[in-house]
């Protein structure tokens, strides 16, 4: 492989590396979006929540904006965090009145294991095309990473209409809601991993005859 | 299919307390939400409150020095308590499920009538 | 709290013909979150729209929702023997829930 190759592959190894950081922070953090409800009566706070693939975690939020509305309240200070009961059956989350969409859930977080499965399966073969200079480990490599990043633009399309149904249930109180960090860093990572993956396989290809009397045989041999 | 049935007096003395029971079948009241309605003879429907199956409540600010709503899981019911009635409380009272936005399951209602 | 007003308060229409309902809101609804219902004399009101446009499950095509802000509208596009009832809106947005007097649809 030549040298502007080389440094053009190294160039996307490390977008997509960055594409990983994200979507493994993705994945392990519960800021994917903000649920708000109706501000109550008695007191000016919001008993907002935030969650993410694996649990949810409520604050009560005090509320100083004029109109006193609930929309686009941060949760912090005291918090309490739960895990959905479906990945941690013995654990009663009664505390947070709140309806989870399970299939959801499940299938959002199962999705995005697979994409932290696929950047692993990826980076080592990456890894190796490097060390013993098997150039052509870079093309499942690369296959690896765009589907890695497909995975998780799934999982966060996943997420979406778990929160669309979350809000528009009755049987929530959630009225507001806002997407948050994690879910910024899952679309990041969905398109540094999904375009990484393309130009790496694009820069992984032999060089195509440049004349018609040559042949794919008289591209540059590959170590 | 989840079903609500409201139950209790038809008839209530002005000044006294005001008790009515929801019980719900075809499903656990774990879980969800569950709301107090009521519709005094021809007029609109009113939001008394609702609570929720681990037993925080949320009132009509117009109610909420009158009004106690509380769960019993074990039985799947769950109660309005209304104090101080007067006539103007006469009216079609209705239980249902979820809290602040829109019912898709009510009860059949049951009049409650306060004369003296 | 919003106080939502119907008008008319009767509407008289043969069977076959349009229905046009309205709520008027006395002050914006977020992220329009009215609901309208039907209610037959004795029974509970029956869920027909949320969301101020989306259709609740099993409810017939004729019936549609519209409007934002302020002021919405139901739509019977045909009117059907058994659609001759009450009719309200709710509004969900803030609290208190609160809905509108009513529409009776009679048969002229």
């Known amino acids: 492989m030549s040298q502007t190759k080389t440094a053009k592959v190294r160039v996307t190894l490390f977008f997509i590396l960055v594409g990983g950081v994200l979507a493994m922070v993705a994945v392990v953090t519960d800021h994917w979006a903000v649920l708000s409800p109706h501000l109550e009566h008695h007191n000016e706070t919001c008993e907002a929540a935030h969650f993410g693939l694996w649990r949810i975690c409520t604050a009560r939020v005090a509320v100083h904006n004029k109109d006193k509305s609930c929309e686009h309240v941060t949760p912090s200070g005291e918090k309490n965090c739960s895990y959905f009961r479906h990945f941690n059956p013995g654990e009663s989350s009664e505390i947070f009145e709140f309806t989870t969409q399970k299939e959801y859930s499940i299938s959002a977080a199962a999705i995005a294991i697979f994409s932290l499965g696929f950047i692993i399966v990826g980076s080592i073969c990456a890894f190796l095309s490097f060390g013993n200079k098997r150039d052509y480990l870079l093309r499942p490599a690369s296959m690896f990473y765009a589907f890695a990043g497909l995975c998780l633009i799934v999982s966060v399309e996943v997420m979406r209409q778990s929160v669309k149904r979350m809000i528009d249930s009755e049987d929530t109180v959630w009225i507001e809601h806002y997407y948050s960090w994690s879910f910024a860093c899952a679309c990041a990572a969905f398109i540094l991993l999904f375009l990484g993956g393309l130009f790496l396989l694009l820069f992984s290809l032999p060089r195509m005859p440049q004349n018609p009397w040559e042949s794919c045989m008289d591209a540059e041999p590959e170590h | 299919q989840v079903q609500l049935q409201e139950s209790g007096p038809g008839l209530v003395k002005p000044s006294e307390t005001l008790s009515l029971t929801c019980t719900v079948s075809g499903d656990s009241i774990n879980n969800y939400y569950w709301t107090w309605l009521r519709q005094p003879p021809g007029k609109g429907l009113e939001w008394i409150g609702y609570i929720y199956y681990s037993g925080s409540a949320n009132y009509n600010p117009s109610l909420k020095s009158r009004v106690t709503i509380s769960v019993d899981t074990s039985k799947n019911q769950f109660s309005l308590k209304l104090n101080s009635v007067t006539a103007a409380d006469t009216a079609v009272y209705y239980c249902a499920r979820g809290a602040v936005k829109y019912f898709r399951h009510w009860g059949q209602g049951t009049l409650v009538t306060v004369s003296s | 709290e919003i106080v939502l007003t119907q008008s008319p308060g009767t509407l008289s229409l043969s069977p076959g013909e349009r229905a046009t309902l309205s709520c008027r809101a006395s002050?914006?609804?977020?992220?329009?979150?009215l609901a309208w219902y039907q209610q037959r004399p004795g029974q509970a009101p029956r869920l027909l729209i949320y969301?101020?446009?989306n259709r609740a499950t099993a409810i017939p095509d004729r019936f549609s929702g519209s409007g934002s802000g302020t002021d919405f509208t139901l739509t019977i596009s045909r009117l059907e023997p058994e659609d001759f009832e009450v009719y309200s809106c709710q509004q969900y947005g803030s609290l208190p829930l609160t809905f509108g007097g009513g529409t009776k649809v009679e048969i002229k």
């Open positions: 969301g101020a446009s």
């Open positions: 002050q914006t609804i977020n992220h329009n979150n």
